[in-house]
């Protein structure tokens, strides 16, 4: 079953068949005897009841108000009323572009990554029984495809696939020919798949410390939204009351990735904290990356080359 028209604001193109379906449809079937009314308001005309006599272009069926076709003067507010249920839509009918096979304002944009699966299927479930044939156009040039009932493109996207694809359904109603156009603006972009998360800075860090003092070890990474960053140390994390994993700070980058940092705070440094590995790991579906910190007493730092020190 075609789902109801839940969007309160709708824009359509003049000259095409169009329908509004209210959202208490299954309820309406149950109470056949209940009075169901459709109204229109526009300009000075408030709440004018609609019926097939209002216009030869309007048809009413159960849950649906149909336009054969919709025209510019159909712009306005529409109401469905049944008992204490009311649904309202604001309809804006725009001019058809006479110089193109589609109207720019009625285009759905889609971004497809190069080499990823790309599909366009021309379907219209509401009008399907009335559709005689359907054609698919790319940039207003007809594509020769085998199936003229539901033309379909299924392929791995290439940059040449970019363009405007218009599905045009041709249908008959009461001896007249109508068409319905649905256009997609397909943009092919470079692969935007997840980055391999990376920990910033050297993989091994010796940190010069003094016993009894505190130290903060900062671990930063560039990662995807679902990637995680965590510290591992000692036998079992949390066994040392002097070691605290601080809250993660995460900020989104302009590219839609995340910059995350997590600090390990070690208070009142003791002998047991020296010369052991404090590992920071970033994990993603694609694998893990780890960097290590080793606390070294300041007095011992002469044994270690200068370039491995961090503050």
């Amino acid at each position: 079953a075609e789902s109801c028209t839940s969007r309160p604001h709708i824009t359509v193109v003049e000259g095409e068949p169009f329908y509004l379906k209210h959202c208490s449809c299954s309820l309406a079937h149950e109470i056949e005897t209940t009075t169901k009314s459709w109204y229109k308001s526009s300009g000075s005309q408030e709440h004018v009841e609609l019926n097939p006599r209002s216009s030869s272009r309007i048809a009413l069926h159960d849950c649906v108000l149909e336009f054969w076709p919709v025209e510019l003067n159909d712009t306005g507010s529409y109401f469905f009323q049944m008992k204490n249920y009311t649904q309202k839509w604001k309809l804006n009918v725009i001019r058809r572009n006479k110089h193109s096979c589609f109207t720019e304002r009625q285009v759905t944009s889609k971004i497809v990554e190069v080499k990823k699966f790309f599909q366009i299927t021309c379907e219209n479930s509401y009008y399907q029984t009335l559709v005689n044939s359907t054609s698919l156009y790319k940039n207003c040039k007809k594509l020769l495809l085998e199936n003229n009932k539901n033309p379909t493109i299924k392929k791995n996207a290439e940059f040449e696939d970019q363009g405007y694809y218009s599905c045009v359904h041709f249908l008959h109603h009461n001896g007249k020919l109508f068409n319905i156009t649905k256009t997609f603006n397909i943009t092919i972009v470079e692969d935007r798949s997840n980055i391999v998360p990376v920990l910033l800075g050297p993989k091994l860090n010796h940190v010069a410390v003094e016993l009894g003092k505190n130290v903060r070890l900062n671990c930063s990474a560039l990662l995807n939204e679902e990637d995680v960053i965590y510290w591992m140390f000692g036998e079992e994390n949390g066994s040392d009351p002097n070691i605290h994993e601080e809250k993660e700070m995460r900020i989104m980058t302009p590219e839609g990735k995340w910059h995350a940092s997590k600090v390990l705070r070690i208070e009142n440094i003791g002998e047991s904290n020296l010369n052991v590995l404090y590992n920071c790991t970033v994990a993603s579906t694609g694998g893990t990356d780890t960097k290590s910190f080793i606390l070294v007493r300041k007095a011992d730092m002469a044994d270690i080359p200068g370039h491995v020190f961090t503050r």
């Epitope: 971004i111 990554e113 990823k116 935007r192 995680v228 965590y230 994993e245």
Partner: antibody
Framework: EVQLQQSGAELVKPGASVKLSCTTS????????IYWVKQRPEQGLEWVGR????????KYGPNFQDKATITADTSSNTAYLQLRSLTSEDTAVYYC????????????WGQGTLVTVSA | DIQMTQSPASLSASVGETVTITCRAS??????LAWYQQRQGKSPQILVY???TLADGVSSRFSGSGSGTQYSLNINSLQPEDFGTYFC?????????FGGGTKLEIK
């Protein structure tokens, strides 16, 4: 201001399908994942799945692999949840959500869409 | 998949009291945990993210703690507006499952 606006309540028959929408504002939908959560009447919360609108990549919870399809239209900043072969078990409020800007937690939620499956 | 076990399932308390709700994860989730409050007929609202960080605009009467697999939400000096249902949720790896919820009622 970040907002997630969901479509209205749906009353559908068993075996039918329904498509719910979640229109976002205050941010670019391509920059952040959109998640869907199910809550049956007087029950807990269940993670349905998520979409990365930038590339259409989706993940689903174990109970929703064959039940749900999540899509997104970046031109209208809208995410969709389609549910098929509906049964009374699918009667629930469905929420869309996104993370806050700073980490682990859904900082922003839609107002929810009630789907009622009834003959 | 990580499972979250939340306790108690329901709790009665009086205004002014302090209550604690706990969540146990089936594996180490390294503080990737959020707490939410949900009032009747409303969407959940985040209280705490990253296990311990209070979300913007949340009263300091709420606090999150824990590490590894064990986490708690503490509510000090209960106020009438605190009554509702509380959920925890892990963010360690998808699916991001929720705890079963704790219904906090006025005694």
């Amino acid at each position: 201001e970040v907002q997630l606006q969901q479509s209205g309540a749906e009353l559908v028959k068993p075996g039918a399908s329904v498509k719910l929408s979640c229109t976002t504002s205050g941010f670019n939908i391509k920059d952040i994942y959109i998640y869907w959560v199910k809550q049956r009447p007087e029950q807990g919360l269940e993670w349905v799945g998520r979409i990365d609108p930038a590339n259409g990549d989706t993940k689903y919870g174990p109970n929703f692999q064959d039940k749900a399809t999540i899509t997104a239209d970046t031109s209208s900043n809208t995410a969709y949840l389609q549910l098929r072969s509906l049964t009374s078990e699918d009667t629930a409020v469905y929420y869309c959500a996104r993370r806050g800007n700073y980490g682990a937690g859904f900082g922003y939620w839609g107002q929810g869409t009630l789907v009622t499956v009834s003959a | 998949d990580i499972q979250m076990t939340q306790s108690p399932a329901s709790l009665s308390a009086s205004v002014g009291e302090t209550v604690t709700i706990t969540c146990r994860a089936s594996g180490n989730i390294h503080n990737y945990l959020a707490w939410y409050q949900q009032r009747q007929g409303k969407s959940p609202q985040i209280l705490v993210y990253n296990a311990k960080t209070l979300a913007d605009g949340v009263s300091s009467r709420f606090s999150g703690s824990g590490s590894g697999t064990q986490y708690s939400l503490n509510i000090n000096s209960l106020q009438p507006e605190d009554f509702g249902t509380y959920f925890c949720q892990h963010f360690w790896s998808t699916p991001y499952t929720f705890g079963g919820g704790t219904k906090l009622e006025i005694k």
